[in-house]
């Protein structure tokens, strides 16, 4: 008894595909090991079709794919655009060689059947549109019209010229004749469901002179397309149900049992599971229309439902396309925190993955806001601007060849909580989804700057403290200038570390930053913060101001624009953060589309890109003390 | 509210042939796998075999004990299937069980694999 166990026998039909799944006892050795799929020859000899050591025969070439499921110790084989040659005996197995641990399949592919020459074979997609033509002679012009439906030797009357229609097909048969035709009726049946399936007979008249016509109609359920995805990475679910239903309102839904539970639909309904990681974009005008999840887990796995119906449920009779997920737990894409937490005045530093093969990619981070079908717009990115209420307090940090770059924000409020993206315009499977939450703070920030309203004068000397804690001791601090595009590190120096490595004096560890002489372009937002290598952490901002020598008004009040910082209510805070909405940049759509539709997915560039490293003084009139 | 009734249960020779049915009632959607198992006396619940519906393909799995004696059939427009049983051995005896899933997730081997089941009909093989 072999301890591989599939299917024995499958059938299909021309065209068609089959998915079959080999089921393998679950060791390690199983698990890593050569899984094959191969023909059995009369010779007795199994020749290797596809295997998963990345061998794909010529005739599988462009229609099959195996893949290896471990954590269900199971691995699929897929067949596309079967013919009746593909017809025999297989074997899917386990082994270095093609003899190891297997199971024998029988698959049969059979021609599409088919009927006696007058019959009009008629297919079509469950919740579609069928139109039967009737034809029928110039003596029957004038007698009764009807479409009857096959039952055993029965045949009921569907719909009649005298304007019957069976009650199971009420308000979704018509029969009309087209223009001045004198020798064709029509009868249309909308909203198809599996028991309209079956053969109906059309008749023009009665007795020995009636004309009949012979149609199969064959209401396909949808054939799941299978989708392939890693933990963690992303899912796009395209949907295209056609222009009848372009108007109406659109949902995905997960099959649960006899039911399909909407995840979202354009009526604002969606689960919380998906809460913060899900996004429904209308393509065009026509009714097709995408869902995108990101952060999958295993848990997602399964089948999928996209449709349309006014009520935004699933309903009978209407169009839907289907699809099969399975979540690969073997994934390239790293564990990251899903939750960062952060307090109010304090920072949080949001470390994104990106598939390290793409190191040049841009990076962006958006705010997924739940409103309607969800949207997500960037807020930074490494062609983009930082937009409006995040000036001075987001910054995103490129480290080329790490696989991750970093995002900071600080000066946080409550408003600051929810769902963020980061995503690159590079491998879309690589968007990572994280919470944040910012509870109100309760002890003194660990960073803090003095003065702390700031303003320096042209021409003068200006330096500038942060004072942090011994916890701090042994981290990189530093001073860096945010601009729109970064936030570019200065000179600066840290007098903590004068003191010896044994002893901390907590009143005395400081990080200063000196501008000498001070420039008109030195106003701005400066941040004092600490790392360790390329791993960031908190920051603290501060506003300077430059005044003229002569005058005594300053550019800018630097108490209104720390407080922003420091102590201000929150809804002075939020006041003076957010502006207007009508600038938000939308994310580009294009970075949600298949990966060939990505090009220039940072409009909003400015000519020259962030730094990654924000390294240089450049321009800058800092000094070293 | 769903009701999977399995008919075709009786009494026969070793040797013999036996066909069992099973129907869906109280469903909306087409299932996509239908299974048997049997219980013997004492015993716990076994897989004898399932058929499985995706899109125009079918699949059909069988227990190792009854390959090749066995044959399983169904139409899921109808939610029907069909257990041909011949060669009936006395290791076939147990009340024979009708399952069935609107999905074809997990291993078909295991009861978990299934949401509804039938009440059971009995086959006894006598010598």
């Known amino acids: 008894q072999s301890p591989i166990f599939g299917p024995q026998d499958v059938s299909s039909i021309e065209g068609n595909s089959v998915s079959i799944t080999c089921y393998y006892p679950d060791t390690s050795v199983n698990r890593h090991t050569r899984k094959y799929w191969c023909r059995q020859g009369a010779n007795g000899y199994c020749a290797t079709l596809i295997s998963s050591n990345g061998y794909l025969s010529k005739e599988y070439s462009g229609r099959a794919s195996l893949i290896n499921f471990p954590e269900n110790s199971t691995f699929v084989i897929n067949i596309a655009h079967l013919t009746q040659e593909d017809t025999g005996s297989y074997k899917c197995g386990l082994g270095t060689t093609n003899r190891g641990l297997f199971f024998d399949v029988s698959l049969e592919v059979s021609q599409v059947p088919e009927f006696p020459n007058d019959t009009h074979v008629y297919t079509k997609d469950i919740g579609r549109t069928v139109t039967i033509e009737c034809r029928f002679k110039e003596g029957n012009a004038h007698s009764k019209k009807s479409l009857c439906k096959k039952r055993g030797e029965a045949c009921e009357v569907v719909i009649d010229s005298t304007e019957y229609v069976d009650p199971s097909y009420k308000d979704r048969a018509i029969l009309f004749m087209k223009g001045t035709s004198r020798d064709i009726f029509y009868v249309n049946i909308s909203h198809l469901i599996p028991s309209d399936a079956g053969l109906y007979v059309c008749q023009a008249g009665e007795g020995p002179s009636a004309d009949k016509n012979n149609a199969d109609l064959q209401v396909l359920e949808p054939e799941p397309e299978l989708l392939y995805k890693d933990l963690r990475s992303s899912v796009t679910f395209e949907c295209d149900l056609g222009r009848e239903v372009a108007n109406d309102a659109k949902y995905l839904c997960r099959k649960n049992k006899e039911t399909c539970d909407v995840i979202i639909n354009t009526l604002g309904k969606r689960d919380p599971a998906f809460e913060g990681r899900i996004l429904l974009t209308p393509r065009d005008d026509n009714g097709r229309f995408s869902v995108l999840i990101t952060g999958l887990r295993k848990e997602d796995a399964g089948h999928y439902q996209c449709g349309a119906h006014s009520s935004g449920l699933p309903q009978e009779g209407w169009p839907v396309q289907a699809w099969q997920l399975f979540v690969n737990e073997e994934s390239t894409i790293p564990n990251s925190r899903s939750v960062v937490k952060g307090v109010t005045g304090g920072s949080v530093a949001i470390v994104c993955p990106y598939n390290p093969k793409e190191s040049s990619s841009l990076k962006y981070w958006c705010h997924w806001e739940a409103d309607e079908n969800g949207r997500c717009p960037v807020l930074v990115g490494t062609q983009a601007l930082v937009q409006e209420g995040y000036e001075g307090r987001l910054a995103l940090f490129d480290q080329p060849g790490s696989g991750a770059y970093t995002v900071i924000l600080n000066q946080l409020t409550t408003q600051d909580s929810g769902f963020y993206w980061c995503l690159t315009d590079g491998d879309s499977r690589w968007r990572t989804t994280i919470e944040l939450q910012v509870a109100e703070a309760t002890k003194k920030p660990d960073l803090e700057v003095t003065p702390q309203n700031a303003t320096a004068v042209i021409g003068e000397t200006f330096t500038i403290s942060c004072h942090y804690p011994c916890k701090f001791y042994s981290q990189e601090k530093y001073w860096c200038k945010w601009s729109n595009d970064g936030c570019h590190i200065l000179p600066s120096h840290d007098e903590g570390a004068r003191q010896s490595s044994v002893s901390c004096d907590q009143s005395s560890q400081i990080v200063s930053m000196t501008l000498n002489p001070v420039k008109k372009e030195d106003e701005g937002w400066y941040w004092c913060g600490v790392k360790e290598g390329q791993v960031y952490g908190e920051t603290t901002a501060i506003y300077v101001a430059v005044e003229e020598r002569t005058r005594g008004s300053p550019h800018i009040n630097p108490t209104d624009a720390n407080a922003r910082a420091k102590d201000a209510p929150e809804e002075e805070a939020m006041e003076s953060s957010v502006r207007e909405d009508e600038n938000k940049a939308n994310l580009d759509p294009r970075l949600f589309a298949d990966e060939r539709e990505i090009q220039n997915a940072g409009d909003q560039a400015q000519e020259n890109r962030a730094s990654g490293n924000a390294g240089s003084a450049g321009g800058q009139s800092g000094s070293s003390k | 509210e769903v009701q999977l009734v399995e008919s075709g249960g009786g009494v026969v020779q070793a040797e013999d042939s036996l066909r069992l049915s099973c129907a869906a009632s109280?469903?909306?959607?087409?299932?996509?796998?239908m299974g048997w198992f049997r219980q013997a006396p004492g015993k716990e619940r076994e897989f004898v075999a399932t058929i499985e519906w995706s899109g125009r393909s079918t699949y059909k799995y069988y227990d190792d004990s009854v390959k090749g004696r066995f044959a399983v059939s169904g139409d899921n427009t109808k939610n029907t299937m069909n257990l041909q049983m011949k060669g009936l051995n006395l290791e076939d005896t147990g009340v024979y069980y009708c399952?069935?899933?609107?999905?074809?997730?997990?291993?078909?081997?295991?009861?978990?694999?299934?949401?509804?089941w039938g009440q059971g009909t009995q086959v006894t093989v006598s010598s």
């Open positions: 109280g469903l909306s959607f087409s299932l996509s796998r």
């Open positions: 399952a069935a899933n609107p999905n074809n997730y997990g291993d078909p081997r295991t009861p978990g694999a299934y949401q509804y």
